[in-house]
């Protein structure tokens, strides 16, 4: 039998199934134990759980078998809608040992929420029992086969099926996706909807209008050849209960990136500039690397610039290999798998001073035994602009006698270029060395100056200057 | 679409504090530096305060210490918070989206290359 | 404080005629070419016309155009249209400073 939703309440109105007699008052129990018996009468003088004396194989065989009585085997209704179904037994007094009507789905038992009732109708012969079962408002999750289930004289016996069938509007369990495609290239969109009712059919729809005409068995692929714009896809999903829309998916066409919105620059050296950017839109398509263009701001310089490439992530750059003191225009771009963006706008900016790269010349060490102190003399080295201003110069003394050894550095002053150290040690060795310190730091130490203070007034040294290099050009 | 709308504006009396907000749609606030710039009326344009996408912030002299820009990545807004209001702050108040920025951060400052985008304005009226 | 100064302050003109606007800094832009141009008409927001000194903002007609560097700056309509008139501004940023200064207006209104 199928009972159609219109059919419902005639479900409970009907004569109850068996011999029940005319106004007879049933005894009801909300289901909520597996266990529910009906109270003590005449002819059932055992209580609930309690077990009646056993019968013999033989009289077990002269039972009369016992079924549930035959009921609604599909009901059809729509969602939201309330829906109410039973099972009955009749038991007669021969059986001794009866449990409570257990109400199943889909194989599994119904426990705690579900609202059934089970109710009692003793008479002389026995116990009818029916078990009621109801659902407010019923979703799609409630469809399925229901069943009863009872255990007499350890028998387990099963309820026909009573299937619950819930149409409604078709229900998407696939919905398109956005996605990002290359401009003028093929790609699919998915759409899959259910219901029941069956079959479900779908309509594609681009930007408000319909793509087939005619619609198309779910699922449905939907092959786009190629878009020149961005797009708003939908699908329709129509049953004989009516139409459901699936979200709209917006397929973007990739383009290239945007440039980068910002440009930090976040420390400098005397050689290197370290940049951090932050990446414009990305043009729908994940961007691969990025390119530091660097060129000499200097309006007199040939203006060829230095691309330095790196990955797009981390967004940091170290710019190396720069002059010192020199001022640099610095453009950032970002590339996706369609092209590069345009470059960043130029920004400033300066490599700190470097240290200088020649150390002092002509280098003389005279001893003046009459003051106990070396004389050391030198010439300013050619320091070219990019190494900074000149500040001072370090003079590293060494001193080297049979047992000791001493390590000592003085600085002085851009202003001379000559110091005296006083002697440290006699009968030893003293090895000068000078460098020149600009802000960006100490430049080379010159070649080693030795000279020997003797235990007396003897004085020996060699040599004690360092000859000027060849190519002093600043 | 991509916009910029300004709100919490009103009548304020001197001395009062009041909190603009500026909600920002089709793009995001954490990639992108954001403006405040202001206008009394009759007036030309004022510059008051700018926010880095990473939040490193800057304001006008005038500024410093009475209005905080700050914002909610989260939810894509833009705040300036304005304390110890003047009758002088009287004045249409246009948040506005930064098309460059270069930011200097070992000497604490930033340049702004353009404003690309502004909002509508909301009015700021100080007066008791 | 750094200043942006422009001229004319109020400028008197007829559709199809060709109108300059000067915008004086009193310090080098920033990168001697960090200045934007800005219309705005009233009750409106100011939109973006020129960044670059001379870069066309998008959307933005080819009557339009800006030339200068360092610290002199103009903006040329070739042709007034109606929708043009309106009030024009000049803004820059400069080295050391976070200060995005505004020209103080010009103001183009039919003759």
């Known amino acids: 039998e199928k009972w159609e939703e219109t059919e419902l309440d005639q479900l409970f109105s009907g004569p109850l199934p068996g011999r029940l007699p005319v106004n007879h008052r049933p005894f009801s129990a909300p289901h909520s134990s597996r266990d529910q018996l009906p109270p003590p009468q005449t002819g059932r003088s055992h209580p609930a759980h309690t077990a009646a004396p056993q019968v013999t194989s033989t009289a077990s065989k002269l039972l009369p078998p016992v079924a549930f009585n035959h009921t609604i085997g599909h009901i059809v209704l729509s969602e939201h809608k309330n829906v109410k179904f039973n099972c009955s037994i009749n038991i007669p007094n021969t059986y001794q040992e009866t449990a409570g009507i257990s109400w199943w789905k889909d194989g599994k038992e119904l426990l705690g929420a579900h609202h059934s009732i089970t109710q009692f109708y003793p008479d002389e012969e026995g116990v009818s029992i029916i078990a009621l079962f109801s659902i407010a408002s019923v979703q799609r999750s409630d469809n399925g086969s229901y069943f009863c289930k009872m255990k007499v004289n350890n028998r387990e016996i099963v309820s026909d099926p009573i299937y619950v069938e819930v149409q409604g509007l078709p229900y998407f369990i696939k919905q398109p996706e956005s996605v990002n495609v290359t401009r003028n290239t093929a790609f699919n969109l998915t759409c899959q909807a259910v219901g029941p009712p069956e079959p479900v059919n779908i309509f594609w729809v681009q930007n408000s209008s319909r793509v087939n005409e005619k619609p198309e068995r779910s699922p449905s692929v939907l092959t786009v050849p190629g878009l020149t714009e961005t797009a708003v896809f939908s699908c329709e999903a129509h049953n004989d209960k009516g139409l459901t829309v699936s979200k709209g998916v917006h397929i973007n066409i990739k383009v290239i990136p945007s440039p980068p919105t910002e440009v930090h620059i976040l420390n400098s050296t005397a050689h290197s500039i370290l940049v951090s950017w932050v990446p414009g839109f990305d043009g729908y398509s994940p961007l691969q690397n990025c390119s530091i263009q660097v060129k000499e701001a200097d309006r007199l310089s040939n203006g060829s610039v230095m691309v330095f490439n790196t990955s797009a992530s981390p967004h940091l750059y170290e710019i190396q290999q720069l002059q010192a003191l020199a001022n640099y225009s610095i453009a950032v771009s970002c590339r996706n798998e369609i092209g590069w963006s345009a470059v960043s706008p130029w920004i400033l900016a300066s490599t700190t001073e470097g240290a200088p790269s020649v150390a002092p010349l002509n280098i003389t060490v005279f001893l003046n035994e009459s003051n106990n102190i070396l004389d050391i003399r030198w010439t300013k080295p050619p320091i070219k602009r990019q190494d900074g201003e000149l500040v001072g110069y370090r003079i590293s003394h060494v001193w080297e006698s049979a047992g000791t050894y001493k390590e000592l550095s003085e600085e002085v002053s851009q202003n001379g270029s000559w110091a005296q150290i006083p002697v440290q040690i006699h009968n030893a060795t003293c090895t000068v060395r000078i460098a020149a310190i600009t802000k960006g730091g100490i430049g080379p130490f010159s070649e080693p100056v030795n000279i020997i203070i003797p235990e007396h007034s003897k004085v020996d040294y060699a040599p004690s200057s360092t000859p000027a290099p060849g190519n002093t050009d600043s | 679409e991509v916009q910029l709308v300004e709100s919490g504006g009103g009548l304020i009396q001197p001395g009062g504090s009041l909190r603009l907000s500026c909600a920002a749609s089709?793009?995001?606030?954490?990639?992108?530096?954001m403006s405040w710039v202001r206008q009394a009326p009759g007036k030309g344009l004022e510059w008051v305060s700018i926010i880095s996408s990473s939040g490193s912030t800057y304001s006008a002299s005038w500024a410093k210490g009475r209005f905080t820009i700050s914002k909610d990545n989260s939810k894509n807004t833009l705040y300036l918070q304005m304390n110890s209001l003047r009758a002088e702050d009287t004045a249409v108040y246009y948040c506005a989206r930064v098309g460059f920025f270069v930011g200097y951060g070992a000497y604490d400052y930033g340049i702004i290359h353009r404003l690309d985008l502004w909002g509508q304005g909301t009015l700021v009226t100080v007066s008791s | 404080d750094i200043q942006l100064t422009q001229s004319p302050s109020t400028l008197s003109a007829s559709v199809g005629d060709r109108v300059t606007i000067t915008c004086q800094s009193s310090k080098s832009i920033y990168n001697n070419n960090w200045l934007s141009w800005y219309q705005q008409k009233p009750g409106k927001p100011p939109k973006l016309l020129i960044y670059?000194?001379?870069d066309l903002a998008s959307g933005v007609p080819s009557r339009f155009s800006g030339s200068g560097s360092g610290t002199e700056f103009t903006l040329t309509i070739s042709s007034l249209q109606p929708d043009d008139f309106a009030t024009y501004y000049c803004a820059g940023g400069y080295s050391g400073d976070s200060d995005y200064a505004f020209g103080g207006g010009t103001k183009v209104e039919i003759k």
């Open positions: 089709g793009f995001s606030l954490s990639s992108n530096a």
């Open positions: 670059d000194a001379s």
